[in-house]
């Protein structure tokens, strides 16, 4: 008789989900001398336990403890970017100026980037049927409660100025529910973060309105002087040309605003 | 939004050649990684090459290694794969895949990940056979 399945509202654990996870550690380690010693089978094991055998919506950070332990890295605190709904770019840059870190540059980051899981209660098994929707069916899921354990760490971690993409496409440039807004600005260290410095990308080519202006920037501004943190925004009219000026900063074109 | 469409592929003879094209439309691939991926009938879809986009280092599967070459033509937003050598066994729906991420092409002990790359063309149809 075919076990009752609990079905979720979200996608299902990402085909070959195992597989994939081991084969982004083994690749990570094998270019990251620093982080040469760890043991990705105990990597994949840690993360497996994390979720495996435990109700999908029922997930703690404490639950990640052992993988967080096994993945502890240290990146140059001063070369931390943040991003908020432009991932793309913000991966581009990093790709191009290779001396800074998003969340997704680090081993752990890497790991689980795009990917979803989820298992069952008291089975064995991963579920690649359904996971739960954080709106629709719970918060306290596998993928959700990682980020969150992940993008506390990250933001926690930074020192000096940090630095924001935010995209000036969207009607909310700043989201206070995004991980960005609801997690990585609450965790910054005042003690130890100087400023925090937003980048607003610019999607159409005419665009030339001062998008530091918008509400949503200001309101991200408040949050973070009350936090006794220094904020300054920049306009990034043109993000083609700016990533052809962080690669050739020697270009005569790039002394001009991008 | 990025686009990406495949040609070149078609029916060819054991020991023949082709070459599939990966054109960019909508988009820059200055900035991206291009993987080539195929799928034969009832196998999973697997990573054989791929090309990064600052220093044009590529990587390859075993499986074709010293038969196909990937390249890069920024300038005309296309990427190559020169498949030579041809078998049988090379049966399948041609891929491409762009990524922005910094480890989708690297290292050396694995072929590019599936997961790693966001953004996919159609497939092109090739087929080695006498």
């Known amino acids: 008789v075919p076990r009752w399945r609990q079905q979720w509202s979200g996608p299902g654990t990402t085909k070959r989900f195992p597989e994939t996870v081991l084969a982004r550690c083994v690749k990570y380690t094998e270019i990251h001398p620093e982080m040469r010693h760890v043991d990705c089978q105990s990597v994949w094991d840690a993360f497996k336990g994390a979720f495996i055998s435990k109700h999908p919506c029922n997930i703690t950070e404490e639950d990640y403890q052992p993988l967080m332990k096994l993945g502890t890295q240290t990146v140059p605190c001063n070369k931390i970017l943040l991003w908020s709904r432009i991932k793309d770019l913000a991966h581009q840059f990093t790709q191009v100026q290779r001396d800074m870190f998003t969340l997704e540059d680090t081993l752990l980051g890497y790991l689980a980037d795009d990917l979803t899981w989820c298992g069952e209660f008291n089975t064995s098994k991963i579920n690649y049927q359904s996971c739960p929707d954080w709106r629709k069916d719970c918060s306290n899921n596998p993928v959700s409660v990682f980020w969150k354990t992940v993008s506390r760490r990250f933001a926690e971690a930074a020192c000096d100025v940090v630095h924001v993409m935010l995209n000036g496409s969207r009607s909310k440039i700043f989201d206070k529910n995004s991980t960005f807004g609801s997690v990585e600005v609450h965790n910054l260290q005042p003690e130890k973060v100087q400023t925090l410095e937003a980048w607003v990308i610019h999607g159409g080519r005419e665009d030339s309105r001062d998008l530091c202006q918008d509400p949503t920037i200001k309101e991200l501004e408040s949050i973070i002087s009350k936090r006794n943190i220094q904020f300054s925004c920049k306009n990034i009219y043109r993000p083609d040309k700016f990533l052809q000026c962080v690669k050739n900063p020697e270009d005569s074109s790039c002394t001009s605003e991008i | 939004q990025v686009q990406l469409v495949e040609s070149g592929g078609g029916l060819v003879q054991p020991g023949g050649s082709l070459r599939l094209s990966c054109a960019a439309s909508?988009?820059?691939?200055?900035?991206?990684?291009i993987g080539w991926f195929r799928q034969a009938p009832g196998k999973e879809r697997e990573g054989i090459s791929c090309?990064?986009?600052?220093?044009?280092?590529?990587l390859y599967a075993d499986s074709v290694k010293g038969r196909f070459t990937i390249s890069r033509d920024n300038a005309k937003n296309t990427v190559y794969l020169q498949m030579n050598s041809l078998k049988p066994e090379d049966t399948a729906v041609y891929y491409c895949?762009?990524?922005?991420?910094?480890?989708?092409?690297?290292?050396?002990?694995?072929?590019?990940?599936?997961?790693?790359?966001?953004?996919w063309g159609q497939g092109t149809q090739v087929t080695v056979s006498s």
């Open positions: 895949a762009a990524s922005p991420r910094r480890l989708a092409c690297a290292g050396s002990l694995y072929p590019p990940l599936s997961a790693d790359f966001s953004s």
């Open positions: 909508g988009f820059s691939l200055d900035y991206y990684h």
């Open positions: 090309i990064s986009s600052s220093d044009g280092y590529t």
